[in-house]
Every structure is written in C-alpha cells, then in structure tokens.
Interface confidence: low
C-alpha cells in the first residue's frame, strides 16, 4: 500500500475531521468465531470466458438481519430490517432523507459472527458511507470475499486470494446478468494468514475506496451506477468475523 489512508483521503475532501471516524485504530480485539467451512462457489479462473463462472450469486444461506451494534449512540441504533422478501426498498424507491444519519455505526451484533455473513444495507449505499469489517484471517487461508449485492448482481466483488498459482492477489469484479465482467487485479496484498485485519470501504460518488489496516489499498469505479439498489453486503471466506458495520462520515 502507499500509506494513504481513508482518513487522509477525506482530509482533503472538505471534511478534515469526519464524524464517526475513529481516532485510534488497530486496537480492537480480534474475535474468535466458529467458521463453518462454507466456500464460495467456483474458483473464478482469471482467463476463462464468462460461461466458466457459476451462474448463481454467492451463498444465500446468510443469517437474518443483525441486531443493534453495541457501542452505537443509544438514539441512533438501527436494528436492521426484517429478512425475507420485501425487506428492502424496491427499485425506484430511494430511502427517505436522513436514512443514514451520521450517528452510526449500524450493523452486526457483538462477534464472533457466523461466516458467510450478510449485512443489510437497507437504503443502498450512498457517498460518504463507510463500511468497516473487523476480523482475523484463518490459518492457511485461501480466500476472502466481500460482495456488495444488488439482487443477484454483485456490484463490487472484493476478493483477496491467498494462493492463485502460488501468488497472492486481490481480484475485484462486477457480476451482472449472471456473468462476471472484466477483472481488476491488485498485487499489493496486506492480508496475512492468522492475523487480524480491518477492511474499510468508503463509498464515493464515482468509486469504492478500500483501505486495509488503515492504509489505502485500491479504488474500484462504480459499474452499477444505481447505488441505492446495492442493498446488502455478503462477507465470506476463510476468516473469523468480529464485526461488520457502517456509518456516515
């Protein structure tokens, strides 16, 4: 990484001290949680045509909506919507103004969390929304995946691979109409088997900005432009997941 943190990025964007931005990072305890060994379908060969990819979205057996995230200010705790059909606003019905007040974070209950895990994003994602995932990479890990989903589509697939042809690489992509698009690959790899991590994804008007362990890692231009339709984040892979939350900054 280039030691460029999201904090630095925001400092130059008219918000030098954004609300909800932690002052000291890396001190959160790493959680230990049971990982059921679920794997993501398919290996995503880098050079294969779209037909080689599995036609289904990432595993659907996510637990229901989480409860209130501990540590959030009492008035701002968001318990999450009910799970199941109709739980999310339909296309063309953006959430009400102020649906994401800057008082979060909202999200997962106290860890550890069961992986794969689903974090609902009831109003979709919006610029200046910060998603934070804390956890520990399992020993001998093979992969991690974050999937920002719009129905069956994956608007942003963030996929660190620990051993792709004996190399460590991060692959980002988008799945539309049941097919994967062009991969964007990043050889900077800040994850280590057995070690805790913090992933932060900041939604910007034109892209997602990703930082790992407080250092800027990459950005991914929006291919799905209707951000309000990106209504959940799937977290999967070889990790013990401590928490997953979001806040507005």
């Amino acid at each position: 990484a280039d030691n460029f943190s999201l904090h630095d990025a925001l400092s130059g964007s008219g918000n030098p001290n954004p609300q909800g931005w932690p002052g000291a990072w890396g001190n959160q305890p790493a959680g230990a949680g049971g990982y059921p060994g679920a794997s993501y379908p398919g290996a995503y060969p880098g050079q294969a045509p779209p037909g080689a990819y599995p036609g289904q979205a990432p595993p659907g057996a996510y637990p229901g909506a989480p409860g209130a995230y501990p540590g959030a200010p009492a008035p701002g705790v968001y318990p999450g919507p009910p799970s199941g059909p109709g739980a999310y606003p339909s296309s063309g019905q953006p959430s009400a103004t102020g649906a994401y007040p800057a008082t979060g974070p909202y999200g997962a209950p106290a860890g550890p969390l069961i992986v794969p895990y689903n974090l609902p994003l009831p109003g979709g994602v919006v610029p200046r929304m910060l998603i934070t995932i804390l956890g520990t990479v399992k020993p001998n890990a093979n992969r991690i995946a974050l999937d920002f989903q719009r129905g069956n589509d994956v608007a942003f697939h963030f996929n660190p691979r620990f051993n792709e042809n004996n190399r460590r690489v991060i692959v980002c992509n988008t799945k539309l109409d049941n097919n994967w698009g062009r991969e964007e690959r990043q050889s900077v790899f800040p994850f280590e088997s057995g070690k805790p991590f913090k992933i932060q994804v900041l939604v910007e008007p034109d892209h997602f900005k990703v930082a790992v362990n407080d250092a800027h890692l990459l950005q991914y231009n929006h291919r799905v432009k209707k951000l309000n339709e990106i209504s959940k984040l799937g977290i999967s892979g070889d990790i013990d997941l401590t928490s997953a939350s979001y806040t507005m900054i």
Epitope: P50, S91, N152, D177, N179, G181, H222
Partner: antibody, heavy 117, light 110 residues
Framework: EVQLVESGGGLVKPGGSLRLSCAAS????????MNWVRQAPGKGLEWISS????????YYADSVKGRFTISRDNAKNSLYLQMNSLRAEDTAVYYC??????????WGRGTLVTVSS | QSALTQPASVSGSPGQSITISCTGT?????????VAWYQQHPGKAPKLMIY???YRPSGVSNRFSGSKSGNTASLTISGLQAEDEADYYC??????????FGGGTKLEIK
C-alpha cells in the same frame, strides 16, 4: 433446444394498445434476465426494456418509458410487453431476447407491430 | 442512451480481412462493460458473434474476432466469405442497467 417465440404483434391505430408475449423453452427461464429489442423497418436495433429474473429490477429506454410495461411469469416461462399510447414510430419488429452481461445470446424470430391509421 | 458509433458500411473481397469499429464513451464501451457483436442477415433475427469483448460462442467461426481499447471496440473478420455479407451491430451494457446498440454496419462482399 433453447427457444424464444414471440406473439401478439399486429396492426394497431395510433394511441392504441397491444400486448406482446414471448414463450421460452429449453432453459431455466427464471435464472435469466430478459429483454425486448426492436427494429424499425430498414433501421438498426434498439434495446427498449429489460427485466431481471426475479422481476425486482426493471429498466426502460427513454423512448418508451411511461408507455410500455415489461413483465414476466416465471411459472409460465413467459415474458410480456404491454404497449400503450402507441405511435407511428413504434412500428417495428419486436424481439424477445435472453441476456447475459457478455451479450444477448438467444433471440426469438420477432413479431411485427404496425402502428398506422 | 445515445447509440454507439459504427461506420455505415464497409466492403471487402473474398479472402480479405475487414475491421468494423464501434466507438462509445466511458459510460458504456470504455467503462469496463462488455461489448458484444451481432450479425444479422436480411429478414432474420440477429445472431451473437462475439461476447465479453472478444469471446466467440460455440459454433461461430474463428474468422471472427473482437477486441477493445479504451472507448473503441473492433470486430475483425478474416478470410471474407460470401455468407459474411450482412449487417453487424455492436452493443454494450451500461452502468445504468440499460443496453445501447451501434447504428449498424453493412458489410458488402465485392
């Protein structure tokens, strides 16, 4: 055999309505996003609408927005296009098309809609 | 939702190679979205010839190839044959979940 068969085309007066149907067979219909694409006589192809497998996401070209409605019945393996307030410029062959991110891989033979007084 | 730009016509002799260009913007062709190419003979439905910028569906001759650079995609047909005479259309997905077609290119075999 993967197949799409359109029906419902015909002659209609300006301002009138028509409902097109598309019967799908040979594949798991609900797994695929579907489209309507049209082609005016002697002109190029124009995408006009798409609908996701679950019907949750629906999109239209500006030229038909507010007048046309796409829908599907996965139990019947059928795609529909309800066309209201038809205009002369809507005269075209209408194709039912299966889509993927990479391309529209299965096309019906088309049904002709003629809007004329 | 403006159309992608293609030449109205191209021509070539049997055995030659031709290239048809398709120019869009960063919102479609250049925006990491995949370009597809279709062949249409008179009175027939379009047929997918190239998808995912450069992949051929099974059954399509390897004389057809696709590529993309920046905001421009290209279809190359080598070893032209009489049956290649047809209209060719490019298409791209856009970030707004719509699709956009090129205006079409008529290929004439001399």
């Amino acid at each position: 055999e993967v197949q799409l068969v359109e029906s419902g085309g015909g002659l209609v007066k300006p301002g009138g309505s028509l409902r097109l149907s598309c019967a799908a067979s040979g594949f798991t219909f609900s797994n695929y996003n579907m489209n309507w694409v049209r082609q005016a006589p002697g002109k190029g192809l124009e995408w006009i609408s798409s609908i996701y497998g679950s019907s949750r996401y629906i999109y239209y070209a500006d030229s038909v927005k507010g007048r046309f409605t796409i829908s599907r019945d996965n139990a019947k393996n059928s795609l529909y296009l309800q066309m209201n307030s038809l205009r002369a410029e809507d005269t075209a062959v209408y194709y039912c098309v299966r889509s993927s991110y990479g391309g529209m891989d299965v096309w019906g033979r088309g049904t002709l809609v003629t809007v004329s007084s | 939702q403006s159309a992608l730009t293609q030449p109205a016509s191209v021509s070539g002799s049997p055995g030659q190679s031709i290239t048809i260009s398709c120019t869009g913007t960063s919102s479609d062709v250049g925006g990491s979205y995949n370009v597809a190419w279709y062949q249409q003979h008179p009175g027939k439905a379009p047929k997918l010839m190239i998808y995912y910028d450069s992949y051929r569906p099974s059954g399509v001759s390897n004389r057809f190839s696709g590529s993309k650079s920046g905001n421009t995609a290209s279809l190359t047909i080598s070893g032209l044959q009489a049956e290649d005479e047809a209209d060719y259309y490019c298409s791209s997905y856009t970030g707004y979940s719509t699709r956009v077609f090129g205006g079409g290119t008529k290929l004439e075999i001399k």
